[in-house]
């Protein structure tokens, strides 16, 4: 038994035929100690008396609110409620799994941007006596500080002859940094209560796992002189982290008629403007998403072919983002080529991926504790790789970001990568392999050394461990190289001679 | 399945004019966008332009624009192409494609050899 | 009009071994690109669209990397079915442009 809260009560239970229940000791919150009596919820039926009432709790008819009375007075209430473990596995009575993105998915969250803020949601088919409270922090060992709101119903659907209920709750990361790379998880905590039953959810993720940018907006449609073609420019949407140069967008651009099924023209752009071929009773629809990370797309946003009157052309806002400051030198060197190393790590992002695009969607976490690898370098808050950090002067962020390359070069170089089980002959491993010392090439400046991180003795017994290990480290790598492509994308806008 | 049957092989002299046609089966002819490539003996893929049979809408590569026509009749899920003033350059085995995406090609034709030559 | 460059123009290469195709793109185009194989005295026929994205009824020995101007097609293991010419395909913009095309033969 624990205290859920002040004088809420659950009691976990085993939950099988003839199961022996628990013994529960109740003591009345009261500095007298004759004359008291004990009932369960409204019975004025006397259970026992004394301070202390000692119950088996073996079912949800022993639940409820105790209550000890003196002489017609209630001294204090305890409420209990019922946890039951069916088979060692926790009840998952109360919410709906939501089998997306897996089975077992009874918690959904989304963030619209890379600022701490993040929206969880649940749907339950149970329309009263229930309660739900929402915790959150960054890491479970030594966690840090997420605000969460209050949970509210946000939508009601008919489902066949059910009713679906959708519970909504907004959290915020207490102190967000939304340009660094994350190495601990935000873990969602949901406690919910129907009627006596208690059952908690739990969901853990980065950030950059649950974006979801907006749609784009103010679609405009421009048609082209004698052609066929429509020029439609768009703009980032409003809820999108800043600056663009920094924060940047990637975009899908169709033209498709009501039907999934009809034919279409697709194009995919980094620009806010795309040339398509528009037909009468189509629509053309834009959506965006991260362009480092591979999270979820936006929905579309969709303006009919038929509007495709005389309306200005594109003025999107994923441009450069500022004016020109110069980078401070580099001990030993000049300022990188920004444009260079921009195309480089926007390649790396491309090949980690590729490299292993089904991690995403592995909870590699199952398999070990949240520091799984906190072995290696991450680009953290005050490693100025922010666009204010690396205005005022880019070389630690540079200096990080060299670090980090040579780190997982030297990873993907080793045992971990070369051992049994043999990587598929078609990885892009060895592309990746390759590209990072490119980069880490073109980021070093001639004649200067920067001191490099000492690489951890990771290196497995076990063929399965190391396929493991490999998810982890390329999951991991993923999220540096975002960083990096950012920094670099960044950079090339708005620091380049 | 969707398949496209080309016209057989076509000997022009320089100057005239070649009409090539491309029959459609195993698909509802309207629902896909139809293609021209043409390929030069021993050289690579050239893209000619694209008709949308729904509405005879047409795009042509720069380089053929004046010089070429592509049509379709719905009634025998038919296309043609007609390239006009030949040169012995035009020499190619031109293929037709069709795809529910403008933008490649999934399925083709067999092609249909075009030699120019006096 | 974009250009698309091709290399190498001739890959000699064993069965079993891996072939390693690149496409250069005259400017950026996203993932915007397509690959084909064409094999002597047949029409070409499509492998990976969009880059990345694989076929249904293409072999998994058939994969697709790159965005912007740095596209790769990787034959992680070549059977003797794959000797043939390779083309990639921006659809970035029109006119639609071909690369010259790679000839993967036997060593």
């Known amino acids: 038994i624990w205290e859920l809260k002040k004088d809420v009560y659950v009691v976990e239970l085993d939950w099988y035929p003839d199961a022996p229940g628990e013994m529960v000791v109740l003591t009345c919150d009261t500095p007298e100690e004759d004359g008291i009596t004990w009932t369960l919820d409204q019975s004025s039926e006397v259970l026992g008396s004394g301070k202390t009432l000692t119950i088996q709790v073996k079912e949800f008819g022993d639940a409820g609110q105790y209550t000890c009375h003196k002489g017609g007075e209630v001294l204090s209430h305890s409420l209990l409620l019922l946890h039951k473990k069916e088979d060692g596995i926790w009840s998952t009575d109360i919410l709906k799994d939501q089998k997306e993105p897996k089975n077992k998915t009874f918690l959904r969250c989304e963030a619209k941007n890379y600022s701490g803020r993040f929206t969880c949601w649940w749907l339950t088919t149970i329309s009263t006596d229930l309660t739900f409270s929402v915790k959150s922090s960054r890491g479970s060992s030594d966690p840090q500080g997420v605000t969460c709101g209050a949970a509210t119903l946000s939508a009601e659907r008919v489902r066949g002859d059910n009713k679906e209920y959708e519970y909504s709750v907004e959290c915020q990361e207490d102190s967000a940094c939304p340009a660094a790379e994350e190495s601990l998880p935000i873990e969602v905590m949901v406690d919910a209560v129907h009627k006596l039953k208690y059952e908690n959810y739990t969901s853990s993720f980065f950030i950059r796992d649950i974006i979801k940018p907006d749609p784009p907006k103010n679609l405009q449609l421009k048609p082209l002189k004698n052609s066929r073609q429509v020029e439609v420019s768009w703009e980032y949407p409003d809820t999108w982290s800043t600056p663009h140069s920094y924060f940047s967008l990637t975009f899908c651009v169709q033209v498709q008629g009501k039907s999934k099924a009809e034919k279409k023209d697709r194009v995919f752009t980094d620009k806010t403007s795309a040339t398509v071929i528009c037909r009468k009773n189509a629509s053309i629809s834009v959506r965006a998403q991260d362009r480092y990370y591979s999270s979820s797309w936006s929905e579309w946003a969709s303006v009919p072919c038929s509007g495709s009157g005389s309306s200005r052309g594109g003025s999107g806002s994923g441009g450069s983002g500022g004016g020109g400051s110069k980078l401070r030198a580099v001990p030993g060197g000049s300022s990188p080529a920004w444009t260079q190393c921009q195309q480089l790590s926007q390649k790396l992002c491309t090949l980690a991926w590729s490299a292993h695009p089904l991690v995403g969607h592995m909870d590699l976490r199952e398999e070990g504790d949240e520091e799984t690898t906190n072995d290696v370098p991450h680009i953290q808050c005050g490693d100025g790789c922010d666009p204010q950090g690396l205005r005022d002067n880019s070389q630690f962020c540079l200096q990080r970001i060299h670090q980090g390359l040579i780190f997982y070069e030297k990873l993907l170089g080793s045992d971990i990568f070369t051992g049994e089980p043999s990587l598929l002959p078609d990885s892009p491993v060895g592309q990746l392999h390759a590209s990072l010392l490119g980069l880490s090439q073109l980021l070093q400046p001639e004649g200067h050394h920067w001191e490099t991180q000492q690489i951890p003795s990771l290196s497995p017994s076990q063929p399965w461990q190391r396929l493991l290990l490999r998810f982890k480290i390329l999951r991991s790598l993923q999220a540096f190289v975002a960083v990096a492509a950012r920094v670099f994308a960044h950079g090339a806008a708005t620091l380049s001679p | 399945q969707v398949q496209l049957v080309q016209s057989g092989a076509e000997v022009k002299k320089p100057g005239a004019s070649v009409k090539v046609s491309c029959k459609a089966s195993?698909?509802?002819?309207?629902?896909?966008?139809l293609h021209w490539v043409r390929q030069a003996p021993g050289q690579g893929l050239e893209w000619m332009g694209w008709?949308?049979?729904?509405?005879?809408?047409?795009e042509y590569a720069p380089k053929f624009q004046g010089r070429v026509t592509m049509t379709t009749d719905t009634s025998t899920s038919t296309a043609y192409m007609e390239l006009r003033s030949l040169r012995s350059d035009d020499t190619a085995v031109y293929y037709c494609?069709?795809?529910?995406?403008?933008?490649?090609?999934?399925?083709w034709g067999q092609g249909t050899m075009v030699t120019v030559s006096s | 009009e974009i250009v698309m460059t091709q290399s190498p123009a001739t890959l000699s290469v064993s069965p079993g071994e891996r072939a390693t195709l690149s496409c250069r793109a005259s400017?950026?185009?996203?993932?915007?690109l397509h690959w084909y194989q064409q094999k002597p005295g047949q029409a070409p026929r499509l492998l990976i669209y969009?880059?990345?994205q694989s076929i249904s009824g293409i072999p998994a020995r058939f994969s697709g990397s790159g965005s912007g101007t740095e596209f790769t097609l990787t034959i992680s293991s070549l059977q003797s079915e794959d000797f043939a010419v390779y083309y990639c395909?921006?659809?970035?913009?029109?006119?639609?442009?071909f690369g010259g095309g790679t000839k993967v033969e036997i060593k």
């Open positions: 494609n069709a795809n529910k995406e403008l933008r490649y090609f999934d399925v």
């Open positions: 195993g698909y509802t002819f309207t629902d896909y966008y």
């Open positions: 008709i949308d049979p729904e509405n005879g809408d047409t």
């Open positions: 400017q950026s185009i996203s993932i915007n």
């Open positions: 969009f880059a990345s």
């Open positions: 395909q921006q659809s970035n913009s029109f006119p639609l442009t």
